[in-house]
């Protein structure tokens, strides 16, 4: 799913207020809901009919530093016999997410939001048209 | 996938530098990669063997204001005949993502990161145990 553009309103003060100095704003330390948990079914990436693997990318100047990307293992989907069914296709489910980029020069540290496209997993679909013309 | 805890390091300046004043830091306006595109406008949610619907939540004090949540339509998966196969399960694929929460009192505006759990779509899995004993 796509994150809409910021436009020029969300990060600005109300019109009646003095503008934000220097094109930056105040970000409070700490994260709301930091301790919430993901309750994903166990090993769904291996048990799915459109199974996937995970690759971890690491960047110490990004929060979260670890971003996990899924890659579908097959082109087709896995049938009840454990064979690849080529009439169905394993397709990636993608999600735009925000990360925070840290930029520093000496003791001057600033942060900026960054959009990252994450493949979260795969699902099995029926192509609209089965064959080329 | 789970976002690790911030700990006490990412948003802090190096030890040799003066501490961040008032528990806040500088967030630059603008978003890196704002124009990148998601190629997901293909109705996979309807054509998946584990189809899902979308619900949009809206909050003007959150960026992005619109957060889309998926809900699996069925317990089972849809077979080639378009019928629900209850030997297989439709399960949600969840992803922790960051949003920005806006807090304001008069002209004093600050922002804080918030973790949100998003269901991105669904996938069809083989249950670990098919039948109770």
């Amino acid at each position: 799913r796509k994150i809409p553009k910021v436009g020029h309103t969300f990060f600005q003060k109300p019109e009646s207020c003095p503008p934000v100095p220097g094109g930056s704003m105040k970000l409070d330390i700490g994260i709301i809901n930091e301790n919430q948990r993901v309750s994903m079914s166990r090993n769904i990436e291996s048990r799915s009919t459109s199974p996937w693997n995970y690759t971890v990318t690491w960047d110490p100047n990004r929060y979260p530093s670890e971003v996990v990307q899924a890659q579908c293992r097959n082109l087709g989907c896995i049938n009840a016999q454990g064979k690849e069914d080529i009439s169905m296709n394993s397709v990636p489910i993608q999600q735009e997410t925000l990360v925070v980029r840290r930029k520093h020069q000496g003791c001057s540290v600033s942060f900026q939001l960054e959009k990252v496209l994450v493949t979260v997993g795969c699902t099995c679909v029926t192509p609209v048209i089965h064959h080329v013309q | 996938r789970k976002i690790p805890k911030v700990g006490h390091t990412f948003f802090q300046k190096p030890e040799s530098c003066p501490p961040v004043p008032g528990g806040s830091m500088k967030l630059d306006i603008g978003i890196i990669n704002e124009n990148q595109r998601v190629s997901m406008s293909r109705n996979i949610e309807s054509r998946s063997t584990s189809p899902w619907n979308y619900t949009v939540t809206w909050d003007p004090n959150r960026y992005p204001s619109e957060v889309v949540q998926a809900q699996c339509r069925n317990l089972g998966c849809i077979n080639a005949q378009g019928k629900e196969d209850i030997s297989m399960n439709s399960v949600p694929i969840q992803q922790e993502t960051l949003v920005v929460r806006r807090k304001h009192q008069g002209c004093s505006v600050s922002f804080q990161l918030e973790k949100v759990l998003v269901t991105v779509g669904c996938t069809c899995v083989t249950p670990v145990i098919h039948h109770v004993q």
């Epitope: 690849e84 080529i86 795969c122 080329v132 | 293909r42």
Partner: antibody
Framework: QVQLVQSGAEVKKPGASVKVSCKAS????????MHWVKQSHGQRLEWMGG????????SYNQNFKGKATLTVDTSASTAYMELSSLRSEDTAVYYC????????????????WGQGTTVTVSS | DIQMTQSPSSLSASVGDRVTITCSAS?????MHWYQQKPGKVPKLLIY???KLASGVPSRFSGSGSGTDFTLTISSLQPEDVATYYC?????????FGQGTKLEIK
């Protein structure tokens, strides 16, 4: 228009490896699968496998598992097929061929073909 | 794997003749494709989904069949039809092709 341009002919010694490239143009590379087909001395066509540049998904013909490795470089819109431990029976013309996008056409539907790359294995 | 057997392996016919090539699958398949490969050229899709004509293919070509037995027919052979014809099953992994039928003009 869609074009698939393959690398030139190769002559290799038994036991060596070879990597054949297929440069795509005229469409969005990431959105379509790429397949590889072997044709030995003008005879039967054998589907070797296919790869989805977007999802990373790969499907191999079991007969070519361990023999062929399919990869892509999305930034260069190029697909690669590497053959290892070459033997005389690997002497053939190898074709890359574009498959479907998985959404509107099936991944396994082949529409456009490269011009073919001749690999000769000889001591 | 599904084995595809074409017959005949080669045939010679006169311009204007009706030509039939058959393809037999080792087990039932839903769809059959037919490819034409002219000497020194790349394969070209001729018929897809058993009976549908691919874009730009002359109407003298037609396909039929179901289950395990499929047929490619050229209603009136033309000199430019000299080629090797391959059937390909699109049903079961892996994709498999027939061994080819080489068509020549008498």
């Amino acid at each position: 228009q869609v074009q698939l341009v393959q690398s030139g002919a190769e002559v290799k010694k038994p036991g060596a490896s070879v990597k054949v490239s297929c440069k795509a143009s005229g469409y969005t590379f990431n959105e379509y699968t790429m397949h590889w087909v072997k044709q030995s001395h003008g005879q039967r066509l054998e589907w070797m496998g296919g790869i989805n540049p977007n999802s990373g998904g790969v499907s191999y013909n079991q007969n070519f598992k361990g023999k062929a490795t399919l990869t892509v470089d999305t930034s260069a819109s190029t697909a690669y097929m590497e053959l290892s431990s070459l033997r005389s029976e690997d002497t053939a013309v190898y074709y890359c061929a574009r498959g479907g996008d998985g959404y509107y056409t099936n991944y396994f539907d082949i529409d456009y073909w490269g011009q073919g790359t001749t690999v000769t294995v000889s001591s | 794997d599904i084995q595809m057997t074409q017959s005949p392996s080669s045939l010679s016919a006169s311009v204007g003749d009706r030509v039939t090539i058959t393809c037999s699958a080792s087990s039932s398949v839903n769809y059959m494709h037919w490819y034409q490969q002219k000497p020194g050229k790349v394969p070209k899709l001729l018929i897809y989904d058993t009976s549908k004509l691919a874009s730009g293919v002359p109407s003298r070509f037609s396909g039929s069949g179901s289950g395990t037995d499929f047929t490619l027919t050229i209603s009136s052979l033309q000199p430019e039809d000299v080629a090797t014809y391959y059937c390909q099953q699109w049903n079961s992994h892996p994709l498999t092709f027939g061994q080819g039928t080489k068509l020549e003009i008498k």
